[in-house]
Interface confidence: low
């Protein structure tokens, strides 16, 4: 969570010929106010589309009356900042629309009248927590000068306001995997607790309690693989309707990395590798020294006493990048054998083994049948990390301890009666049928459709199924 802040410096006629007429007059005094609309991403959306990141209205400015014959000056502005709170992560890239409105204060029936004087729009990249960015935008003959920044609201910190920090009673008092919140060494990162059950492999969270899926995975806990068989490209946002990945623009298209940074695609979006002296989500922050604390994740900063000399970050184990900003994905080496789930705990790798396997890397195949006896002559069969018993005739259950009811499946055809027998079952066939399961009709002339009954057994006699 955080706040986007906009400071309007001036609104007046732009340079060049054709200075606009003043929006106010002695007969029609007026005052200005501003509206800002923010949308995530760099899309050029219609002005009417929702302000998904938020919107804000300024206070009304001082009443202004034009001096006859004078050119339109910079107009008096409202006091204070325009503040747009955002609840979730700061997206880093955003589109803005700033509108200048005139409130006429004449004798209109029904109160003041409002009219839109100017509208400017743009697309920018901005890391939260950075300095004020200055901008000039023109709309027709008008010129708007303004500054803006995004700042995180405690306890959030970071370029996207997704890390949570709290003041500590003692310096750097942070737990495993939690680092001090630079540059405030007396604050600690708070553990980010994802939704319970969120897949540690395929899910992540930027807000406590959420579970967002890496590309190729779906479901509330990111445990369901997305089918890509019918897709043209493995890139792009997932489609909820088809359950397949729809081709989309590559995250590195157009190289979002500034100041000579190189872009590489990641499962989530993209990553910029910044040259020395630059950092931030898109290498947009410059003039960095060791005093600025550019080394993340406990990296040690060396050199760089002034902005012109380079600094070097010596990264702790498990991190890399010019600012130690990238966690080494040690699980990508697939150290867990036999389908084990890899967990990178920061200080160690752990493998969560499937049933039937054990060992630090799930390398030991447990003998499922060891010490497992199948009763009543059953034999143990291994498979899938669990044992099962193949039971002798007349017995069933997990360990062959239950006597099976051979008649339960109604094996006697054509209305034959079934009788349990110590060695299996016996079918007493209805008149006109014969065979072990009463499956053969007896022909009217006394001959059967298939070979005759065994010697000593008449059609209709019980046939024991051996």
């Amino acid at each position: 969570a955080g706040v986007f802040e906009l400071q309007i410096h001036s609104f007046g006629p732009g340079p060049g010929p054709g200075a606009p007429r003043s929006p106010c007059s002695a007969r029609l005094p007026c005052r200005l106010f501003f509206r800002v609309c923010l949308k995530p991403g760099l899309s050029e959306e219609a002005a009417e589309s929702p302000c998904a990141l938020g919107a804000a209205l300024s206070a009304r400015g001082p009443v202004y009356t034009e001096q006859p014959g004078a050119p339109a000056p910079d107009l008096p502005l409202p006091d204070g900042l325009l503040q747009v709170p955002f609840r979730d992560a700061w997206p880093g890239t955003f589109s803005f629309i700033i509108e200048t409105w005139r409130e006429e204060l004449g004798d209109q029936i029904g109160g003041p009248a409002w009219s839109l004087l100017a509208r400017v729009a743009g697309r920018r990249r901005l890391a939260a927590g950075g300095p004020w960015a200055r901008d000039i935008q023109r709309a027709g003959a008008w010129e708007l000068r303004f500054s803006y920044r995004a700042r995180c609201e405690p306890p959030a910190v970071g370029t996207a306001c997704t890390r949570l920090c709290r003041p500590r009673s003692a310096p750097s008092r942070c737990g495993p995997g939690l680092r001090p919140c630079a540059p405030l060494e007396d604050e600690c990162e708070a553990p980010l607790v994802c939704r319970a059950g969120c897949s540690p492999e395929h899910g992540f969270c930027e807000q406590p309690g959420e579970c967002r899926c890496l590309e190729g995975w779906t479901g509330p806990l990111c445990t369901v693989p997305v089918s890509t068989s019918s897709c043209l490209s493995p890139r792009g946002p997932s489609s909820a309707t088809t359950g397949c990945l729809v081709p989309g623009p590559g995250p590195c298209d157009g190289n979002p990395c500034a100041n000579g940074g190189s872009c590489s695609e990641t499962p989530r979006s993209f990553e910029c590798t910044c040259p020395r002296g630059f950092y931030g989500l898109r290498c947009e922050v410059s003039g960095v020294t060791c005093a600025d604390g550019p080394c993340f994740n406990g990296g040690l900063c060396v050199g760089g006493a002034d902005p012109d000399s380079a600094y070097i970050c010596h990264c702790p184990p498990g991190f890399q990048g010019s600012n130690c900003e990238k966690r080494v994905d040690r699980c990508s080496l697939q150290p867990c054998r036999n389908g084990g789930l890899c967990l990178d705990l920061g200080h160690a790798l752990r493998c969560r083994c499937r049933a039937g396997f054990a060992g630090p890397r799930c390398e030991h195949d447990l003998d499922d049948c060891a010490g497992r006896a199948c009763a009543n002559g059953g034999t143990c069969v291994e498979g899938g990390g669990a044992h099962r018993c193949s039971c002798a005739l007349g017995f069933g259950g997990r360990d062959c301890r239950e006597r099976a009811d051979p008649c339960a499946a109604r094996p006697c055809a054509h209305g034959g009666r079934c009788y349990a027998h110590f060695s299996g079952l016996v079918c007493a066939c209805a008149p006109g049928y014969m065979g072990a399961r009463c499956e053969f009709p007896v022909h009217p002339d006394g001959a059967s459709a298939l070979p005759a009954a065994p010697p000593g057994l008449r059609p209709g006699d019980p046939q024991r199924y051996l």
Partner: antibody, heavy 118, light 113 residues
Framework: QVQLQESGPGLVKPSGTLSLTCVVF?????????WSWVRQPPGKGLEWIGE???????NYNPSLKSRVTISVDKSKNQFSLKLSSVTAADTAVYYC???????????WGQGTLVTVSS | DIVMTQSPDSLAVSLGERATINCKSS????????????LAWYQQKPGQPPNLLVY???TRESGVPDRFSGAGSGTDFTLTISSLQAEDVAVYYC?????????FGQGTKVEIK
């Protein structure tokens, strides 16, 4: 000044469920701290029971895990302990404590004696 | 679980003398990424809850007299009271908070000789 105060019945019958609540004063339960329960049988040492974060995430002592539930009530700025199937061996002074982000327990309640007896 | 073993079980020291308590963990509690030992020391007086003395194995909690000091790394740690005072009579516990399950030592009782 951070203060913690335990409350709950001092006598529980065997096989019953022990229920205790800890109210936090001077700090928000939604801060970055975790909130722990620790117990101490009469004349014996300390045993960590478990902890809870304001999101509801928990960590438990493996030896007690099957019987323990620790929960948090942000609206009342308190957290609770439930220990099921108690026996005389669960008779102890039960303390609630704040686990600073690091994990060291920097603030403790005064403790409440719970006796398991019929 | 990490097992914490303290020695000795009890210790009698003259007023003004040095008292040293040892604590050994069954596995290292040093976290290499920040080079910190996840170990704390507590003092408990009769009828009172424990009181945090030292964390990170050697960082004194604010308000704790400087006669208390912690040292050690990895698996072997010590708490030293440089000059024992009458109010230091208590039971002292070490605790590891390295993983997601924490354990205490069995305690060391410090008395005046």
């Amino acid at each position: 000044q951070v203060q913690l105060q335990e409350s709950g019945p001092g006598l529980v019958k065997p096989s019953g469920t022990l229920s205790l609540t800890c109210v936090v004063f001077g700090d928000s339960i939604s801060s970055s701290n975790w909130w722990s329960w620790v117990r101490q049988p009469p004349g014996k040492g300390l045993e960590w029971i478990g902890e809870v974060f304001h999101s509801g995430s928990t960590n438990y002592n493996p030896s007690l895990k099957s019987r323990v539930t620790i929960s948090v009530d942000k609206s009342k700025n308190q957290f609770s302990l439930k220990l099921s199937s108690v026996t005389a061996a669960d008779t102890a002074v039960y303390y609630c404590a704040r686990a600073a982000v690091a994990g060291a327990l920097d603030y403790w309640g005064q403790g409440t004696l719970v006796t398991v007896s019929s | 679980d990490i097992v914490m073993t303290q020695s000795p079980d009890s210790l009698a020291v003259s007023l003004g003398e040095r008292a040293t308590i040892n604590c050994k963990s069954s596995q290292s509690v040093l976290y290499s990424s920040n080079n910190k030992n996840y170990l704390a020391w507590y003092q408990q007086k009769p009828g009172q809850p424990p009181n945090l003395l030292v964390y990170w194995a050697s960082t004194r909690e604010s308000g704790v007299p400087d006669r208390f000091s912690g040292a050690g790394s990895g698996t072997d740690f010590t708490l030293t009271i440089s000059s024992l005072q009458a109010e230091d009579v208590a039971v002292y516990y070490c605790q590891q908070y390295y993983g997601t399950s924490w354990t205490f030592g069995q305690g060391t009782k410090v008395e005046i000789k």
